[in-house]
């Protein structure tokens, strides 16, 4: 016959924002100014993100939380929880090493950020270019050139649908 | 701890010169881009020059070039602005910063930044 005992750890019924105290006979201690528990049963509270410089306070830190930081405008953030900040282009421009620089024909950005992606290639869905993509915006895409010849409908109906990987008859 | 520490602002008439100084600690600072970026009052922040590993390619925001040289002495660890011919609209809160380049290919953060040093311009 096996005797079971369950030993619950005193710590588990610490709640977040406390502390387990292995000082104080693991009394749950609440987290001291500008620490934090996220979760129960910790035996430390962590300290909170600063955002100092140009990483700017988006939430403060409480007692159950750790603060969240942005950047200061001009730039924005990347990485888990803005570990950096990258500077801002205009629409228009992607970020190189040299810095800013506008999009290359046939290309375009309509973000601060990220890179100038090319312009959609209309004849590859069997359209035609309907307004011209700049440096800022793609192209708008119109009806087939097909559908714009003399004689043809203004309205077209719409293509039938068909089964990826299958030819239309 | 990484630390970078930013000295040599002050106040200097138009047309002078400054040399700004970043001391980094914590952190190989011969590995990494370094880049100063500023920020004038009610503006938002810019980007100044960037400099790579060993100061063979350096490059400047448009406004600063042929007036401001970045350098660097990596057994030192220290990073440089020379500044020179200064304008009214030089004056700003002036920062280094790690990284800018060799993140990866889509991005150019910087993850360590030093508390600023202010640049004033005026007569």
């Known amino acids: 016959f096996e005797r079971t005992r369950s030993l619950q750890d005193p710590c588990s019924n610490c709640p977040a924002g406390t502390f387990c105290d292995n000082n104080r006979n693991q009394i749950c201690s609440p987290c001291p100014p500008n620490s934090f528990s996220s979760a129960g049963g910790q035996r430390t509270c962590d300290i909170c993100r600063q955002c100092k410089g140009v990483f700017r306070t988006r939430k403060e830190c409480s007692s159950t939380s750790n603060a969240e930081c942005d950047c200061t405008p001009g730039f924005h953030c990347l990485g888990a929880g803005c570990s950096m900040c990258e500077q801002d282009c205009k629409q228009g421009q992607e970020l190189t090493k040299k810095g800013c620089k506008d999009c290359c024909f046939g290309t375009f950005n309509d973000q601060k950020r990220g890179i100038c992606r090319p312009w959609t290639n209309c004849s590859l869905d069997g359209k035609s270019v309907l307004v011209n993509g700049t440096k800022e915006r793609d192209v708008v895409c119109g009806p087939s050139p097909a559908d714009l010849s003399p004689g043809a409908s203004s309205v077209t109906p719409p293509a039938p649908a068909r089964e990826p990987g299958h030819s239309p008859q | 701890e990484v630390q970078l520490v930013e000295s040599g602002g002050g106040l200097v008439q138009p047309g002078g010169s400054l040399r700004l100084s970043c001391a980094a600690s914590?952190?190989?600072?011969?590995?990494?881009?370094m880049n100063w970026v500023r920020q004038a009052p009610g503006k938002e922040l810019e980007w100044v020059a960037n400099?790579?590993?060993?100061?063979?390619?350096?490059y400047y925001v448009d406004s600063v070039k042929g007036r401001f040289t970045i350098s660097r002495d990596n057994a030192k660890n220290s990073l440089f602005l020379q500044m020179n011919s200064l304008r009214a609209d030089d004056t700003a809160v002036y920062y280094c910063?790690?990284?800018?380049f060799g993140y990866g290919d889509s991005h150019y953060g910087m993850d360590v930044w030093g508390q600023g040093t202010t640049v004033t311009v005026s007569s």
């Open positions: 910063a790690r990284g800018g």
């Open positions: 914590g952190f190989n600072f011969s590995n990494y881009w």
């Open positions: 400099i790579n590993q060993d100061g063979s390619e350096k």
